[in-house]
Amino acid sequence: MAVTACQGLGFVVSLIGIAGIIAATCMDQWSTQDLYNNPVTAVFNYQGLWRSCVRESSGFTECRGYFTLLGLPAMLQAVRALMIVGIVLGAIGLLVSIFALKCIRIGSMEDSAKANMTLTSGIMFIVSGLCAIAGVSVFANMLVTNFWMSTANMYTGMGGMVQTVQTRYTFGAALFVGWVAGGLTLIGGVMMCIACRGLAPEETNYKAVSYHASGHSVAYKPGGFKASTGFGSNTKNKKIYDGGARTEDEVQSYPSKHDYV
């Protein structure tokens, strides 16, 4: 039950995380105009990975796509690539993890196969989360650098006669969405990897042998003792089945490798 819960929770957390990564990638507010001490502005600029927007005090909002590929900064291209890689890996991970879920019965798929799929999806989620966090962090670093550069030459002009206020940009909502989403995907991936350990059958999984001691029967199992396996629960000379660390509510009356909860 704990394995199923861990796997299921990992899947849900990753799903939320990947949805967040997609949302962040599509959002226009990666960088927003720094308003200094003035919360009300007549023209408010904000930019995303794919387009830049301007919102006026009239409520009119105009967005323009970046219709050039070569003219864009390399860093922006790198961030785009990281986010897309994160989404693609996350989407594949989700697809794999759906089939790996313990609660879903697919033909005669073995636990070992499910364990491998769970591990694969977990790794994919971890890499996906790392890609998103890296992408957002690169963009944030770019913003910080540009912010201080534009602060240094905030006002420029001919002999100080004409002032040109340079627009400074600060962190937009998409960055925070991206960080949180990347973190969630990463956590979900770790949970999937933990669940995989519980799903995988041990290599040294011998058939248990019953030794009859005087007074009462106790089953001994070579290869080390496992909690709630072989003790107390099996005193009627039945073959002990251990398909990984199972909790009590997963114990079935006639265990077989084809049984799924």
Partner: antibody
Framework: EVQLVESGGGLVQPGGSLRLSCAVS?????MNWVRQAPGKGLEWVAW????????TYADDFKGRFTISRDDSKNTLYLQMNSLRAEDTAVYYC???????????WGQGTLVTVSS | DIQMTQSPSSLSASVGDRVTITCKSS????????????LTWYQQKPGKAPKLLIY???TLESGVPSRFSGSGSGTDYTLTISSLQPEDFATYYC?????????FGQGTKVEIK
């Protein structure tokens, strides 16, 4: 079609108060008050977001003038306190249009501050 | 605050003349986000409310005759009336629409010669 009708102007003594109203019909995201002293140019007074009620003022009017709106009545207000002789002007309400323009204007209401 | 300076303060012209009014701002009105200059031109006739002519420095408001045109970028802007008509005799104002507080030029009065 947007229509703006101002009211509430009149004669007031120095130090007195007055509240101007602007009845708004049609879509307005944000509104302005602009004034024009006799024989002088246009002077922007204040702006308000009609949805959030967020205001901003010209420095000369901060503290004395308050811009507000009543959603239910679809009305814009300008509360003017501590009025001075130099506040004598025609007050216009104007809608903020694309490009932060003032694309629709009311007919104006005259405020005279005199003892 | 952005100061707006119009010149000339008044001018005399005849019907059919080409008229040019200039407006200078103390700060650039060009917005880097959309590369648009937030300068607006208005026309006002005596006893009437102002009328919007041009926004974004060069975009003509719908219903405004094509003889009116605007140009400029940064801090220097121009309103041109290609062929002055009798109904064009009025006062013209430029306005900073880039940042609060919105500010107007002192106006240019176009009179009949």
């Amino acid at each position: 079609e947007v229509q703006l009708v101002e009211s509430g102007g009149g004669l007031v003594q120095p130090g007195g108060s007055l509240r101007l109203s602007c009845a708004v019909s049609g879509y307005t995201f944000s509104m302005n008050w602009v004034r024009q002293a006799p024989g002088k140019g246009l002077e922007w007074v204040a702006w308000i977001n009609m949805y959030t009620g967020e205001p901003t003022y010209a420095d000369d009017f901060k503290g004395r003038f308050t811009i507000s709106r009543d959603d239910s009545k679809n009305t814009l207000y300008l509360q003017m306190n501590s009025l001075r002789a130099e506040d004598t002007a025609v007050y216009y309400c104007a809608r903020t249009g694309t490009g932060n323009t003032m694309d629709y204007w009311g007919q104006g209401t005259l405020v005279t501050v005199s003892s | 605050d952005i100061q707006m300076t119009q010149s000339p303060s008044s001018l005399s012209a005849s019907v059919g003349d080409r008229v040019t009014i200039t407006c200078k701002s103390s700060q650039s009105l060009l917005n880097s986000g959309n590369q648009k200059s937030y300068l607006t031109w208005y026309q006002q006739k005596p006893g009437k409310a102002p009328k919007l002519l041009i926004y974004w420095a060069s975009t003509l408001e719908s219903g405004v005759p094509s003889r009116f045109s605007g140009s400029g970028s940064g801090t220097d802007y121009t309103l041109t009336i290609s062929s002055l008509q009798p109904e064009d005799f009025a006062t013209y104002y430029c306005q900073n629409a880039y940042s609060f507080p919105f500010t107007f030029g002192q106006g240019t009065k176009v009179e009949i010669k």
